[in-house]
Interface confidence: low
């Protein structure tokens, strides 16, 4: 009995996953199915044999990448009754050709928060641009947009941030760059001085549990689809 | 098939007070995956965000509009609200109410996935 | 400097293809974007989440024809089999520290 690779899929309430499975080489039916509590058998949810089960449909699409050898399984609308485990497979039988364990995990008991990261390849003199922006965190009621930041919720004491009023206009079709709050143009700062801003201004937000556990939300731990890492400068 | 149906007046006097609704059908408004949020569009310009709120009534506003900008929202009418006051003729544009949804792939972020059709507001006397 | 550059227009027949670019500044080229598309007299829609290496997210029942790819800062969204609906004004937006829902001014595009 072979030990079958296992993955760990987050997502939020109303929002949607892609499961990324492993696609075989000889061409048979390939399905994501789910295991059924006490049972253990696996039902399938949908596969390539135009099979889509009744709670699932209109909001599961599975699509093959044969030169990638891959296929994809994306759930959208998520519910807190689509947590649970999950397998990809090939093959006529769903219970026999398993290939991959899929853990899904729907979370909607936190907060979602802006959550700022440092930007390593930004040179220093780049003034912030803003349209339409945040402060870092405007007061204790006022924004902050991006998932999870650490700690406990409730009293976060106010930053008052002054901000310029001038309305930029926006018609030579492109975003200008401006200042951010204070009277001082703000700009980028070297990634060492950026990371202990950015670090200063997490203890300053609304803060959630689990910081770790929410900031993987979508990711797959194994098999990261796509090349992208922290790099990319946006929480 | 989540849908937001705005309303308010499509004329407000100067140093008046800007209300419009969005109500909410196909999601609850206090859906914790969610924010609702409202943009602007002056004609001939590019859209500023206004603000958000979140599905315990936290707020979040511009900080140019925000000692002008409230925000409520209503659970059991599923609708989410804005006011604006002191409304001059800069104020004149198509507010939009939206849906943002937190989404990570590799990295996280916000997006838009509804919009609402626009409500076109004249500040003029 | 700005964060996000579009061309301010674009045209393309019938049943052909497009491709509309949305250029990062520098020291943004690693940033992700998205694509919302905002036809005549409509609010915006959004179409897609576009990351760096070129793989992309599309909103709910956003057709197959539209399709996101990026070249180092560019950002590209590309129409194939234009449809006279596809007339709008596309823009593109990003985010990251201390910017947020930075819009570019945005293309219009003309279906000949």
């Known amino acids: 009995l072979r030990i079958l690779p296992e993955v760990k899929v987050e997502g939020e309430l109303g929002g949607s996953v892609t499961i990324k499975c492993p696609l075989p080489e000889m061409h048979v039916r390939i399905y994501l199915c789910r295991e059924m509590a006490g049972s253990g058998t696996c039902g399938t949810v949908v596969s390539t044999t135009n099979f889509i089960k009744a709670e699932y449909k209109g909001r599961v699409t599975l699509k093959q990448y044969p030169r990638k050898n891959l296929f994809l399984v994306e759930v959208t609308q998520l519910t807190e009754s689509d947590s649970g485990v999950y397998a990809c497979g090939a093959g006529m039988n769903t219970d026999r050709g398993k290939t991959q364990k899929v853990t899904l995990n729907v979370h909607s008991e936190y907060e979602p928060s802006w959550e700022e990261q440092p930007m390593p390849e930004t040179p220093k003199w780049f003034h912030l641009p803003y349209l339409f922006q945040m402060p870092a965190y405007a007061s204790s009621s006022k924004f902050v947009t991006r998932v999870t930041t650490p700690a406990q919720r409730g009293k976060v004491p106010p930053v008052h941030h002054s901000s310029p009023t001038t309305q930029i206009t926006h018609r030579p079709r492109v975003s200008r760059a401006s200042s951010v709050a204070g009277d001082k143009p703000r700009t980028f700062l070297p990634s060492t001085t950026a990371s202990k801003i950015s670090a200063l201004e997490g203890l300053l937000k609304p803060q959630t549990p689990s910081y770790n556990h929410h900031t993987r939300l979508h990711r797959q731990r194994a098999l990261d689809y796509g090349s992208q890492s922290g790099r990319e400068g946006q929480g | 098939q989540v849908q937001l149906q705005q309303s308010g007046p499509g004329l407000v006097r100067p140093s008046e007070t800007l209300s419009l609704a969005c109500s909410v059908s196909g999601a609850l408004v206090t859906n914790t995956a969610y924010y609702w949020g409202w943009f602007r569009q002056s004609p001939g310009q590019g859209l500023e965000w206004i603000g958000c709120i979140y599905a315990n009534g936290r707020t979040y506003t511009n900080p140019s509009l925000k000692s002008r900008v409230s925000l409520s929202i209503d659970q059991s009418r599923q609708r989410f609200s804005l006011n604006l006051t002191s409304a001059t003729a800069t104020d004149t544009a198509v507010y939009y109410c939206v849906r943002l949804v937190p989404k990570r792939t590799a990295t996280l972020h916000y997006y838009i996935d509804v919009w609402g059709k626009g409500t076109t507001v004249t500040v003029s006397s | 400097q700005s964060a996000l550059t579009q061309p301010a227009s674009a045209s393309a027949s019938l049943g052909a293809s497009v491709k509309l670019t949305c250029t990062l500044s520098s020291g943004h080229s690693s940033y992700a974007i998205a694509w919302h598309q905002q036809q005549p007299e409509k609010g915006p829609r959004y179409l897609m989440k576009l990351n760096s290496d070129g793989s992309h997210s599309k909103g709910n029942g956003i057709p197959d024809r539209f399709s996101g790819s990026s070249s180092g800062a560019e950002r590209y969204l590309t129409i194939s089999s234009l449809q006279s609906e596809d007339e709008a004004d596309y823009y593109c937006?990003?985010?990251?520290?201390?910017?947020?829902?930075?819009f570019g001014g945005g293309t219009k595009l003309t279906v000949l």
């Open positions: 937006q990003t985010w990251g520290t201390g910017i947020h829902w930075v």
